[in-house]
Amino acid sequence: GRLVHMTVVSGSNVTLNISESLPENYKQLTWFYTFDQKIVEWDSGKSKYFESKFKGRVRLDPQSGALYISKVQKEDNSTYVMRVLKKDGYEQEWKIKLQVLDPVPKPVIKIEKREDVDDNCYLKLSCVIPGESVNYTWYGELPKEIQNSVLETTLKPHKHSRCYTCQVSNSVSSKNGTFCFSPPCTAARSEQKLISEEDLGGEQKLISEEDLHHHHHH
């Protein structure tokens, strides 16, 4: 059978369906979870919903064969199989591999290092989120786009503040964290701060291992 991939955000309502029309006047139609767990079967004009973790949150549309699942969770990750028994005795199968992802959490920007190096300022920031498989992109006044969790840059002496935004994303959501840095490089009370929640549309966090009490948190 054909295999289709679907990625959705947890908590959403999902429609599992095939892109082609069902065989005409089919005899029976069954949806399976992980190949052998029956969810629902249609036959003789009625849908039979079986005891499973889906009972009460699925609905079958016999016309299209679509299976509606409400409030999907990560535990619903699986290959779903739609099996159709045709009037001539043949069976046809379609498979949908469903990946349910949580929205990415808000990133924490951590100052790993900042020091004077030959009158320039060396800055190392890391963008941290708990145990997720995500993509990272840093934006700001950078020589090139950086696509990992750590940003290392050397700043020439400057008067104005520099801001760096870390964007974490998976295929269903993305969140930003922005860190602004003002000279001098290692002054005890240097102004390093995060753009506020209102500016970014979400609470951001900053953690610095050194001089933690000097940093302004929002």
Epitope: Q28, K38, E41, D43, F50, E51, D88, G89
Partner: antibody, heavy 121, light 107 residues
Framework: QVQLVQSGAEVKKPGAAVKVSCKAS????????ISWVRQAPGQGLEWMGW????????NNAQKFQGRVTMTTDTSSSTAYMELRSLGSDDTAVYYC??????????????WGQGTLVTVSS | DIQMTQSPSSVSASVGDRVTITCRAS??????LAWSQQKPGKAPKALIY???SLQSGVPSRFSGSGSGTDFTLTISSLQPEDFATYYC?????????FGQGTKLEIK
């Protein structure tokens, strides 16, 4: 894994009745139908009837009409086949077999190990 | 009732041989046909359904073909464990009926 475990061998007198059980495990019992098939010594297979474990709907071969009763107990995931008015030609191994669908498709994917019923005076 | 007739009723073959068993229905059953294998003292085992679909776990040396009234079970290269009796069965209509069986013996 899917298993159908049947009750043990029985010896019955002519005119008596026998009730064979088939306990299912490893799958959602109500999501499949059960057929009963028998095999007389040295003979071929003979379909007796079918029951839906979902709603108890049945269909029996005309030959056994009025003499066979098929039931299920969903709480114990067990199917039963009772055959009454036994004669010597009912001596056979009786098998339960799982249908691929909750309504009968006639396609069996798993079989019980069989129950030998001997009818002898 | 639909009658199912298998041929031959028995066949002798050697390991590695290609074997074909045929089954004929007394009326058109489209593709509503299954094949099963039975060894002495054991329950039947499902091999093929819908004329040509292999049951899960069945080796690919087994194949089925046909539709309407004429059907074939083929074992491409016989293995020692394949010596058994094979039954065809129609699933087109109640009552389901079986062929009389084909006994596959070692030559």
């Amino acid at each position: 894994q899917v298993q159908l475990v049947q009750s043990g061998a029985e010896v019955k007198k002519p005119g008596a009745a026998v009730k064979v059980s088939c306990k299912a495990s490893g799958y959602t019992f109500t999501a499949y139908g059960i057929s009963w098939v028998r095999q007389a010594p040295g003979q071929g297979l003979e379909w007796m009837g079918w029951i839906s474990a979902y709603d108890g709907d049945t269909n029996n071969a005309q030959k056994f009409q009025g003499r066979v009763t098929m039931t299920t107990d969903t709480s114990s995931s067990t199917a039963y086949m009772e055959l009454r008015s036994l004669g010597s030609d009912d001596t056979a191994v009786y098998y339960c077999a799982r249908d691929r669908y909750s309504s009968s498709s006639g396609y069996f994917d798993y079989w019980g190990q069989g129950t030998l019923v001997t009818v002898s005076s | 009732d639909i009658q199912m007739t298998q041929s031959p009723s028995s066949v002798s073959a050697s390991v590695g041989d290609r074997v074909t068993i045929t089954c004929r229905a007394s009326q058109d059953i489209s593709s509503w046909l299954a094949w099963s294998q039975q060894k002495p003292g054991k329950a039947p085992k499902a091999l093929i359904y819908a004329a040509s679909s292999l049951q899960s776990g069945v080796p690919s040396r087994f194949s089925g073909s046909g539709s309407g009234t004429d059907f074939t079970l083929t074992i491409s290269s016989l293995q020692p464990e394949d010596f058994a009796t094979y039954y065809c069965q129609q699933a087109n209509s109640f009552p389901y009926t079986f062929g009389q069986g084909t006994k596959l013996e070692i030559k």
